[in-house]
């Protein structure tokens, strides 16, 4: 088992909004849960976009999940990752 490296980034979207993206990379096996939480509970699936789980060329995998949020509300969101029985949460950078 190779645990993922998880990285959260933010980028400008439309006025007043930002897109936050949570990327998991260099993990094996390919089975992974990556999702956003808002206020400590699950964020509805229809407001999240997931990338495919793809090989990254080193025998490991990568994927991502993104959502659009209001600027100033970053503190309400965390990215949750679960892989091979281990899990972690990752805040949006300020």
């Amino acid at each position: 088992t190779v645990p993922p490296m998880v990285n959260v980034t933010r980028s400008e979207a439309s006025e007043g909004n930002i897109t936050v993206t949570c990327r998991a990379s260099s993990f094996y096996p390919r089975n992974i849960t990556l999702t956003w939480r808002q206020d400590g509970v699950s964020l509805s699936h229809d407001t999240q976009q997931w990338g495919d789980v793809l090989p990254d060329g080193n025998g490991t995998y990568q994927t991502w999940v993104a959502t659009r949020i209001c600027r100033g509300e970053e503190q309400r969101f965390t990215c949750y990752m679960e892989h091979s029985g281990n899990h972690s949460t990752h805040p949006v950078p300020s």
Partner: antibody, heavy 119, light 107 residues
């Protein structure tokens, strides 16, 4: 370390409003986290009532939505529960509790405040 | 709303025994589950979150497991201080709801 302490009257008359205070020490309620009220009925059933967040937003249990208000006084680092039009069914032990944005589990609880609704 | 159904409602076991408490959700809660212990006259104390992770300071004889709608809390080698009520709570969505509880008595 953070500590929560609930307080308020132990007896409320039917049709009146129940008002409780949660005083927080060791952490500013505006910095982070979700500041909740939970009650436990005789017989031990637990019910989440709602929260006020670090930013001042609320989320309430729909079963209480027309009767509940959770507010705060940031200068005193306190948050408050007001439950209107109470009946004997609102007799319970009331807890204030905190969770963080990683997940809505309650790692910090105050001691309970028993509130009896009776004429 | 997601309803949480706990079983058994009560159990009695001897010191050293292994006991298991189960919690069933009315919908898939994707491991968004916590367990609490409550002693008489005290506030609930967090034992487990995210279905499997022990909270700080919780003895390793406690363990959580499960997925989907079915979850369990296991206490290995039951100790006298483990008596009390145990509750599950989901945090998949609002409103947050708790199970009705399991009373654990020491024989």
């Amino acid at each position: 370390d953070v500590q929560l302490q609930g307080s308020g009257p132990g007896l409320v008359k039917p049709s009146q409003s129940l008002s409780l205070t949660c005083s927080v020490t060791g952490y500013s309620i505006t910095n982070d986290y979700y500041w909740n009220w939970i009650r436990q009925f005789p017989g031990n059933k637990l019910e989440w009532m709602g929260f006020i967040s670090f930013g001042g937003s609320n989320n309430y249990n729909p079963s209480l939505k027309n009767r509940i208000s959770i507010t705060r006084d940031t200068s005193k680092n306190q948050f408050f529960l007001k439950l209107s039009s109470v009946t004997t069914e609102d007799t319970a032990t009331y807890y204030c509790a905190r969770y963080d944005g990683r997940g809505a589990w309650f790692a910090y609880w105050a001691q309970g405040t028993l509130v009896t609704v009776s004429a | 709303d997601i309803q949480m159904t706990q079983s058994p409602a009560s159990l009695s076991a001897s010191v050293g025994e292994t006991v298991t408490i189960t919690c069933r959700a009315s919908g898939n809660i994707h491991n968004y589950l916590a367990w609490y212990q409550q002693k008489q006259g005290k506030s609930p104390q967090l034992l487990v979150y995210d279905a499997i992770t022990l909270a700080d300071g919780v003895p390793s004889r406690f363990s959580g497991s499960g997925s989907g709608t079915q979850y369990s809390l296991k206490i290995n080698s039951l100790q006298p201080e483990d008596f009390g009520n145990y509750y599950c709570q989901h945090f998949w969505s609002f409103p947050l709801t708790f199970g009705a509880g399991t009373k654990v008595e020491i024989k």
